[in-house]
Amino acid sequence: HHHHHHHHHHSGGGGSGGGGSGGGGSKGVEPKTESERLAGTESPVREEPGEDFPAARRLYWDDLKRKLSEKLDSTDFTGTIKLLNENSYVPREAGSQKDENLALYVENQFREFKLSKVWRDQHFVKIQVKDSIGQNMVTIVQSNGNLDPVESPEGYVAFSKPTEVSGKLVHANFGTKKDFEELSYSVNGSLVIVRAGEITFAEKVANAQSFNAIGVLIYMDKNKFPVVEADLALFGHAHLGTGDPYTPGFPSFNHTQFPPSQSSGLPNIPVQTISRAAAEKLFGKMEGSCPARWNIDSSCKLELSQNQNVKLIVKNVLKEIKILNIFGVIKGFVEPDHYVVVGAQRDAWGPGAAKSGVGTALLLKLAQMFSDMVLKDGFQPSRSIIFASWSAGDFGSVGATEWLEGYLSSLHLKAFTYINLDKAVLGTSNFKVSASPLLYTLIEKTMQNVKHPVTGQFLYQDSNWASKVEKLTLDNAAFPFLAYSGIPAVSFCFCEDTDYPYLGTTMDTYKELIERIPELNKVARAAAEVAGQFVIKLTHDVELNLDYEMYNSKLLSFMKDLNQFKTDIRDMGLSLQWLYSARGDYFRATSRLTTDFHNAEKTNRFVMREINDRIMKVEYHFLSPYVSPRESPFRHIFWGSGSHTLSALVENLKLRQKNITAFNETLFRNQLALATWTIQGVANALSGDIWNIDNEF
């Protein structure tokens, strides 16, 4: 059930060469008229009203790339990954003593690295754990009423509805919407058994619920997860959202007065993970072979034999825990109030070597290397770099989302990119990436500069790579940054075409990881080089490395999708003229900004600040202003979820062609109008001051 379905890329990162470069250059100093807070910290810098950038020797891209590469060469990643897998830090479920132990270790390391400032945010959040007394249980109820125990699973699914259900059991493959639609039998009133993978647990449960299933069992089948241990337990969560589901849309700082509230993404049915052995025991009582197209092992069966039922008892309980997010910042030299955030999940239900150990090790090493580059090597990043260690990631990016919720109104004006380090090393064959289109150009440049750790070829092998990039998924910590906060985000991994089989299990150990990836240090080095080059490019250059022109092609492909429905739209007496106009305005705004940039005096920090401020707002303005962040947190019209998204609008139109009685025309009219005005809003924001906007629209 891991989430890196990013774009496949055969190649990768080893040594990034890079020749030296001398000479002077220019470095900007950013004026600010008032004290500003680094989100979650105070970091005001009142500055002199200044003229142009002072001419001082400046490290260039080649120098920095080489410095980073040299540091990477002498860094022991595996030692740190192994250290994080030691008993004092394992297992480290969110809020546990061992999670706190590791938090303190990270905090101390940040201090030792001499980051400009190190701090922590404390949150009180509700998670769901197994009851210490009552056991979760799966049982077969025979026709004569006899109970045949199947399993009292060691694993569980957080945020399941704690209840007891009985009914028929049917298989629904991965539990995708398509899987449910293609079943030859009804799941109404039945429990469903689904295999892990393809989509998140939360989506599986939501889909099952929408088809009126009464409960869900999740297991790892042998084909997708070729694990020898058939009794291996599995953990996950079922919240169709991120953050603390009991404080939706607002942060759970201790001083917040919580109104009683809960996320609409919590399931109304019980869900439980079971081992493969338990699943096979159930299949022994079931009939009907699973379709060949499922590509599933032969033990799979479709429906429980007549006159038998399955009983699922889930006794999970809510628990309030204290979590710590640990932060360290390297303060920027020019625009310290603008920052890139590099983050990694710290907690894990099991040992979490691949799930949170690698990311945390990368986070620590990157913090150390960049601090070193500043203190010893003369690197002067224009913008700040925040390193963040999140807790409760295993419960739906809780720590990260709580931080975002705490600073929702201002964060997008300050944090301009999020780089996710979670699960960055799961294999070696492919380099996969998911990101905001604003980062595609940066990603491409990086892939042209980083070599694959095993093949030695540059990661950039396919000029068409961007068209294969998959959307960030709900279980990726980068998702709330992009879809909730409107901050461009990127997540990447070195991984295989197959899922890493031990995520969310007690076998996610350093021992298994190094066995599966003997070149672990090299691969971790490559992952660090990718992230490191992102950081340098995003903080060093005078102009912000966010390619706002990339959304032109996204808008164009949306228009193409809509064009298929020209007749339907005309039949409703509607026109796409205004949408075309809004898209055209966006295109013109991007062209104008590019011209402004080319004509700008690069050494004039006021002009550059104004241009960068316009660029920084692009992603945020793709958040629909017409829905409430509390009811529909993922407001991004491209990457979010809900009726305000462009994909929902297209789906609604498809429904008109498929089943006109199910089509909601009023909803569609709203969707079209609001999408038009959201896109127009982005164009206006990019155009700059109000008097520069052509209001003939």
Epitope: V45, R111, E112, K114, S116, F333, K376
Partner: antibody, heavy 118, light 106 residues
Framework: QVQLQQSGAELVRPGTSVKISCKAS????????LGWVKQRPGHGLEWIGD????????YYNEKFKGKATLTADKSSSTAYMQLSSLASEDSAVYFC???????????WGQGTSVTVSS | ENVLTQSPAIMSASPGEKVTMTCSAS?????MNWYQQKSSTFPKLWIY???KLASGVPGRFSGSGSGKFYSLTISSMEAEDVATYYC?????????FGSGTKLEIK
């Protein structure tokens, strides 16, 4: 409350060594950098170097490499600075100071006077 | 090394007068700290991260600046402000202090 207690004044011969101490209390000794600063009579302040007692990681001002050696004893929460091959220009008051965020030296010892004289 | 030049070296001000002293660095820094030292005592942290006042420092003090140029200002001089003020950078090794500005009262 945070306190840094330094050892007493030293009168030493040229060419010899001296080891001055700085005992920390009131905070987690292993979690903060501890720096050393030199001040000659009537002169300004000079940063000598610092130590992170949790790992014994040290940084030195190039100018003081070979002259100063920084160590720390976790069990007694005490930091030490040994000055070797002493000469008259080493006569100064030496301060230890704890460093927090933004490398702000927020707590200081009272200073140890070292006089090098034959 | 990053040389910090403080000016003036010595200055005197009348009570109630506004006082500004500067610190210029030979290369950019991302923040500046200031210390106050009165004769025969250890230095005290006075301003950190360019503009934040250390605990117990009167509100008449302020700090500002960026890049290579920083300043400490006293809005209204008082007798107890007589001291030597040192700027300090921790942005790159070796960390360095300025030569100090000695503030006297007229």
């Amino acid at each position: 409350q945070v306190q840094l207690q330094q050892s007493g004044a030293e009168l030493v011969r040229p060419g010899t060594s001296v080891k001055i101490s700085c005992k920390a209390s009131g905070y987690a000794f292993t979690n903060y950098w501890l720096g050393w600063v030199k001040q000659r009579p009537g002169h300004g302040l000079e940063w000598i170097g610092d130590i992170f007692p949790g790992s014994d990681n040290t940084y030195y001002n190039e100018k003081f490499k070979g002259k100063a050696t920084l160590t720390a004893d976790k069990s007694s929460s005490t930091a030490y600075m040994q000055l070797s091959s002493l000469a008259s220009e080493d006569s100064a008051v030496y301060f230890c100071a704890r460093s927090g965020n933004f490398y702000a030296m927020d707590y200081w010892g009272q200073g140890t006077s070292v006089t090098v004289s034959s | 090394e990053n040389v910090l030049t403080q000016s003036p070296a010595i200055m005197s001000a009348s009570p109630g007068e506004k006082v500004t002293m500067t610190c210029s660095a030979s290369s950019s820094v991302n923040y500046m700290n200031w210390y106050q030292q009165k004769s025969s005592t250890f230095p005290k942290l006075w301003i950190y991260d360019t503009s934040k006042l250390a605990s117990g420092v009167p509100g008449r003090f302020s700090g500002s600046g960026s890049g290579k140029f920083y300043s400490l200002t006293i809005s209204s001089m008082e007798a107890e402000d007589v001291a030597t003020y040192y700027c300090f950078q921790g942005s790159g090794y070796p960390f360095t202090f300025g030569s100090g500005t000695k503030l006297e009262i007229k």
